[in-house]
């Protein structure tokens, strides 16, 4: 069967009938129909949602939609016991407590099951302490209140603002630092954009609006009763003392009209320097405890939630692949959301329901794709990416042999600016190619390609004339399959020109206020921004499970691979005399960078010249190519996180959502001056560079010729 | 449009108990603060107590601390005032107020919309 009889009609043609049908009218009703009411996972709504959509999927043409369920950890506000933050006097007496829900958006008043605010996972308790104020509660600001400050949070109650770096982060480092309870807040300098009105009159935060999320540090285990395995019906459970992730002390979120009375009476010390203090009319005084005339007054935390095995379902459709069905290029987003979801994440799973109809569409009129597609609407990414985890951890043997590619579709926009694309080095080629093809939908460039603006708008810092593209990170679906399996990984959304604010989120991130009215009035009302990103995810999709040579460059991880192998060596020469010590070298990382490099090029020559007709050799480099990633998977993963086993990205120890490259050799020199054993730091930095240097010589290899 | 509809006043005897209500329309009284306000034959206005939008936080002027209680059902938009131990200075005609703002509670920014029921307390 030659390679073209998958379709009735030319290639090019097909990509242009997939991309004319996406039509924004519908992503809008899509939006609509998806954000009417709350869709928390593990609430009967969102099982509505789960079969409705594969209802709709079905009728839109695909092969089969199954629902896969799972039984994980969820965990909940207690109903009669709410959670909320008091002042108290010194006899005991609450003199001010925090808000218990959020005030609903016009024409939400009468709209039940909305969850209050709430850290998801926090254990329960009632903490009475000072308090201490920790800034975004990253490493350096505990480095610079214990090392710097001499400020001691042992037995403290920390207050933290959210922003730069994922909230489970911040819950870690206040645990390590000893404190015994965790406020979260929103502060106007992270979530309250000068010249715009809150909420309903505006994109911004009202004093009111708090920020939901989890709090675990799961490092990619999923469920956290059922690490490395599926939550089924004969799963064996963890006791909850041995779950994987789970904070130690209790946690809230609040808003800022509430920060602004626990801030206001702090005293102590003073905010170390601007960097500290935020836009409200407070002085950001650390501590602990409360100036003067209220140093009697204490703060103290009120926390019922519990944690609660529930049953979440994911949905996944099949559209089967006429040449090669055994594989799979996957796009999935989740559909579960805190309230109504409208940017997070039904902006997304919008656009992605389009996808398949569009998709679908086509298979009506007699095309397939040459590869499987399979799409997925995912349960519980909101309480820890857990549906897709838990789907690839039962799949895991078929994904990792058929796995071609996955990309992400959650949240469409977190601004109307321009592109974001974060995937991995593979795909650049691809994403370049494609964004020329596409027209830009921003004002001023009428008649010019997304390419265009979104390089003038996001110009690549390395490379002139070329947008920039970032590393894979975490906090979203794609973990599974990228950082455990080694699927060549992908995502886009439309986002905001704010980069010194680039992991804070919109200003209504996870808050009631995240409803259609917000994307239609204030961030895409012709959904032209909507539109796009379906191009470019749905564009993605098309090529990866239709071109008959797989659309990856694997150059492109060549340069790549020197970039973080000089910054690594950089860093690491921060130290010279420990590294003349201690025997350090990198020569064997650039040895096999340099032999990487060759391979690929060579690689890349073969891929130009050989016989496309013949099916064998087409199957051969194109194995060769979808598992280039998956050769950078170390099978024992990273130090203490089994289940990050890719040696090239990982996301950061200090922030989820950030990637960072060569993360062992990162880690191993982190803070390496403070160590109490030089010797063993040093050793492992060097087992490190090992680890690296071999896994990017066995990559290598699997690009050579085979005999 | 805005309507608070004051109702529950009425003549007693002091040291008695009396429970004044405001339902509320034309505007979402789950996400406003509400305050009781009065004024007593000749004088100004004077602000008695407020509760937040969620009933989280209550607050009371020094006169009635101690012996009334404000209160609210989001669920049937409607606003209470229990007064207890009640004192001839206690006679005035009490008003129900939203907050100005969406989701604040000040003491001292409010509306008016009713007409006030009136509370007599004599002997």
């Known amino acids: 069967k030659s390679s073209n009889e998958a379709t009735n009609i030319t290639p090019k043609h097909n990509m242009k009938a997939f991309l004319d049908e996406l039509k924004a009218e519908n992503i809008k009703k899509f939006l609509y129909n998806f954000t009417q009411i709350p869709h928390l996972a593990g609430t009967e709504q969102n099982f509505q949602l789960a079969k409705q959509i594969q209802s709709q999927w079905k009728e839109f043409g695909l092969d089969s939609v199954e629902l896969a369920h799972y039984d994980v950890l969820l965990s909940y506000p207690n109903k009669t016991h709410p959670n909320y933050i008091s002042i108290i006097n010194e006899d005991g007496n609450e003199i001010f407590n925090t808000s218990l829900f959020e005030p609903p958006p016009p024409g939400y008043e009468n709209v039940s099951d909305i969850v209050p605010p709430f850290s998801a996972f926090s254990p329960q308790g009632m903490p009475e302490g000072d308090l201490v104020y920790v800034n975004y509660a990253r490493t350096e600001d505990f480095f610079k209140l214990e090392r710097d400050m001499k400020i001691n949070c042992s037995g403290k109650i920390v207050i933290a603002r959210y922003g730069k770096v994922f909230r489970g982060n911040k819950v870690k480092n206040a645990q390590l630092a000893g404190a015994k309870g965790v406020i979260l807040y929103s502060d106007p300098a992270d979530y309250f954009a000068p010249g715009v009105k809150s909420y309903p009159d505006g994109w911004n935060l009202p004093g009111g609006g708090v920020q939901r999320g989890n709090i675990l540090n799961l490092n990619g285990a999923g469920d956290p009763l059922t690490p490395g395995y599926p939550a089924n019906e004969y799963a064996y459970r963890r006791g909850i003392a041995e779950a994987v992730g789970l904070p130690s002390i209790p946690v809230h979120p609040i808003g800022y009209y509430d920060a602004q009375k626990l801030l206001e009476k702090m005293g102590g010390s003073a905010p170390p320097d601007s960097s500290w203090r935020g836009s409200l009319k407070v002085p950001y005084n650390v501590g602990p405890g409360f100036t003067g005339n209220f140093s009697t007054q204490k703060v103290k935390m009120h926390i019922h939630s519990t944690n609660e095995v529930t049953r979440i379902y994911n949905v996944i459709g099949t559209l089967r692949g006429a040449v090669e069905p055994d594989r799979y290029v996957i796009l999935g987003g989740h559909r579960d959301s805190w309230v109504f979801g409208g940017i997070d994440p039904q902006s997304g799973a919008a656009v992605v329901h389009e996808i398949v109809r569009s998709f679908g569409t086509l298979k009506k009129e007699g095309w397939r794709p040459r590869r499987t597609i399979l799409f997925a609407s995912w349960d519980a990414e909101e309480f820890g990416l857990l549906g897709s985890t838990e789907w690839a951890e039962e799949n895991s043997r078929l994904l990792q042999e058929r796995g071609v590619a996955y990309i992400n579709a959650d949240s469409s926009i977190e601004g109307n600016y321009t592109l974001r694309v974060d995937c991995t080095p593979l795909m650049y080629s691809l994403v370049h190619n494609l964004t020329k093809e596409l027209k830009s939908p921003d004002e001023g460039f009428e008649g010019k390609s997304l390419y265009e603006s979104w390089t003038k708008k996001s110009p690549s810092p390395e490379f002139s004339g070329m947008p920039r593209i970032s590393k894979l990170g975490s906090g979203n679906d794609f973990e599974v399959f990228f950082q455990r399996l080694g699927i060549a990984s992908g995502r886009a959304r439309y986002t905001k020109n704010w980069e010194t604010n680039k992991f804070s989120g919109y200003p209504l991130y996870h808050s009631v206020y995240e409803t259609y009215e917000l994307v239609e009035k204030f961030y895409d009302p012709m959904f032209k921004y909507h539109l796009t990103v379906a191009q470019v995810r749905g564009g993605m999709v098309f090529e990866l499970a239709n071109s008959i040579v797989l659309p990856f460059d694997c150059r492109d991880y060549a340069v790549v691979l020197r970039k973080y192998a000089d910054k690594i060596y950089s860093i690491s020469m921060k130290h010279p005399q420990e590294m003349k010590t201690y025997s350090v070298s990198f020569d064997s990382l650039f040895s096999a960078v340099k032999n990487f490099t060759e391979i690929a090029s060579k690689f890349s020559e073969r891929l130009q010249d050989f016989d496309k007709s013949n099916p064998i050799v087409l199957r051969m480099m194109n194995d060769q190519l979808m598992f280039l990633e998956r050769a950078f998977i170390d099978p024992l993963g990273l130090p203490d996180r089994p289940f990050y086993r890719h040696v090239i990205y990982a996301p950061s120890s200090h922030n989820k959502y950030a990637g960072e490259s060569f993360p062992g050799i990162y880690d191993a020199l982190f803070d390496i001056e403070s160590k109490v054993d030089p010797s063993k730091a040093w050793g492992e930095v060097k087992r490190q560079i090992y680890v690296a240097a071999f896994t990017v010589q066995a990559a290598a290899e699997t690009l050579s010729e085979v005999a | 449009e805005v309507q608070l509809l004051e109702s529950g006043g009425g003549v007693v005897q002091p040291g008695r108990s009396l429970r004044l209500s405001c339902a509320a329309s034309?505007?979402?009284?789950?996400?406003?603060?509400m305050h009781w306000v009065r004024q007593a034959p000749g004088k100004g206005l004077e602000w008695v107590a407020v509760?937040?939008?969620?009933?989280?936080?209550?607050y009371y002027a020094d006169s009635v601390k101690g012996r009334f209680t404000i209160s609210r059902d989001n669920s049937k938009n409607t606003l209470y005032l229990q007064m207890n131990s009640l004192r001839p200075e206690d006679t005035a005609v009490y008003y129900c107020?939203?907050?100005?703002?969406?989701?604040?509670?000040?003491?001292?920014?409010?509306?008016?919309w009713g007409q006030g029921t009136t509370v007599t307390v004599s002997s």
């Open positions: 509760i937040s939008y969620d009933g989280a936080n209550r």
């Open positions: 107020a939203k907050e100005r703002i969406f989701g604040v509670l000040t003491p001292d920014d409010f509306e008016i």
């Open positions: 034309g505007f979402p009284f789950i996400s406003y603060g």
